[in-house]
């Protein structure tokens, strides 16, 4: 005879999934806006800073009362892997002036991967589908001047300050609804 | 200096609808959550929802889904709460307040707009 | 909902002294580090103020002899020497969840 069977798989709790990843997020997103403060200290920024390659905001006006688990984790997915990619090329490429940054924009780095296993995980957990493997992006062009790594700079942490709050939102918001 | 200014008190009839305004100035109005919150008298403060200014993305305490509405003018820094199908127990003061991204804590209030319901 | 219950509903005090203040949550608001509490003190005819953030944060402009503290379900906020201009109410109120709800509030009276 084979092996005897493994203890029953003990379906998760899903509010407690979703409870661990809101605390991370939670989390990333105090470390953001701590770090997008201390860029506006060093470098204020003159207005809104946009950078084409970021993805648009999830949250529109009706969407969050529409939200559905599955849909919130694959776009919160998506988009937190651009962002991702984007600290990355902002260490990279950002020029001398944002090496003020570090290590706070490496910390950040670590934890924005750490969130996107946490993701991951979730996902798996819960059994939802599993996105299909992200086609090669194409590689971001650098900044052209030192003063465009601080306006993408500007844009990067704002928008993953955004991005955060949705997901902390929308998480919380169908944590009620399991 | 931060401030939160709302529109004036408001006399309605039972079944009506209000609107309320809260203008922003002094900060960057996309860079925090605009809030709402009721305090009905003898009653303890109770959250109606907020909204991203940003994105003008509203989330509501399920008790006041379907009734109230909230919206923003990001170009006026003004933020709107409508509260429709008013009744008795919708008499109030209505504070709109500036919440911490992601952590609904209210660091700036508005000074409040009196709400009475009345036949 | 998270329930906040504090005590005392009224507490009556003269200046100088000190007032320690209680919030009990119906469960748990803190996680990994973070405490979800907020207190917010109300003078008559004014909107609320807050105090302090995260249970223990102190906002920017508040007096020193504020503090907050706690994590669980039990927390405190103390005045460490009342001055003439702390009687008021003081409610609680937590974000661990969605939605936020505050304390039925303290009461504090010059005694």
């Known amino acids: 005879p084979g092996p005897p069977p493994g203890p029953p798989r003990v379906s998760p709790d899903p509010r407690a999934e979703l409870d661990s990843t809101v605390l991370l997020t939670r989390s990333l997103l105090a470390d953001t806006r701590q770090l997008a403060a201390q860029l506006r200290d060093k470098f204020p920024a003159d207005g809104d800073h946009n950078l084409d390659s970021l993805p648009t905001l999830a949250m529109s006006a009706g969407a969050l009362g529409a939200l559905q688990l599955p849909g919130v984790l694959t776009r919160l997915r998506a988009d937190l892997l651009s962002y991702l990619r984007h600290v990355q090329w902002l260490r990279r490429a950002g020029g001398s002036s944002l090496k003020t940054l570090e290590p706070e924009l490496g910390t950040l780095q670590a934890r924005l991967d750490r969130l996107l296993r946490r993701l991951q995980l979730l996902m798996s957990r819960l059994a939802l589908p599993q996105p299909p493997p992200d086609p090669p992006a194409p590689p971001l062009a650098p900044p052209s001047s030192a003063w465009g790594g601080i306006r993408a700079a500007h844009a990067i942490l704002g928008g993953l300050h955004l991005t955060l709050d949705w997901a902390v939102r929308g998480l919380l918001l169908l944590k009620t609804r399991l | 200096e931060v401030q939160l200014v709302q529109s004036g008190a408001e006399v309605k009839k039972p079944g009506a609808s209000v609107k309320i305004s809260c203008k922003a100035s002094g900060y960057t109005f996309t860079d925090y959550n605009m809030d709402w919150v009721k305090q009905a008298p003898g009653q303890r403060l109770e959250w109606i929802g907020d909204?991203?200014?940003?994105?003008?993305?509203?989330i509501y305490n399920q008790k006041f889904t379907g009734r109230a509405t909230l919206t923003v003018d990001k170009s006026a820094s003004t933020a709107y709460m409508e509260l429709s199908s008013l009744r008795s127990e919708d008499t109030a003061v209505y504070y709109c307040a500036r919440g911490e991204l992601g952590h609904w804590y209210f660091d700036v209030w508005g000074q409040g707009t009196t709400v009475t319901v009345s036949s | 909902d998270i329930v906040l219950t504090q005590s005392p509903a009224s507490l009556a005090l003269s200046p100088g002294e000190r007032a320690t203040l209680s919030c009990r949550a119906s469960?748990?608001?803190?996680?990994?580090?973070?405490?979800?509490i907020h207190w917010y003190q109300q003078k008559p005819g004014q909107a609320p103020r807050l105090l302090i953030y995260?249970?223990?944060n102190l906002d920017s402009g508040v007096p020193a002899r504020f503090s907050g503290s706690g994590s669980g379900t039990d927390f405190t906020l103390t005045i460490s020497s009342l001055e003439e201009e702390d009687f008021a109410t003081y409610y609680c109120q937590h974000s661990r969840d969605l939605p936020p709800t505050f304390g039925q509030g303290t009461k504090l009276e010059i005694k």
């Open positions: 469960k748990s608001v803190s996680t990994s580090g973070y405490s979800y």
């Open positions: 995260l249970a223990s």
């Open positions: 909204i991203n200014p940003h994105s003008g993305g509203p």
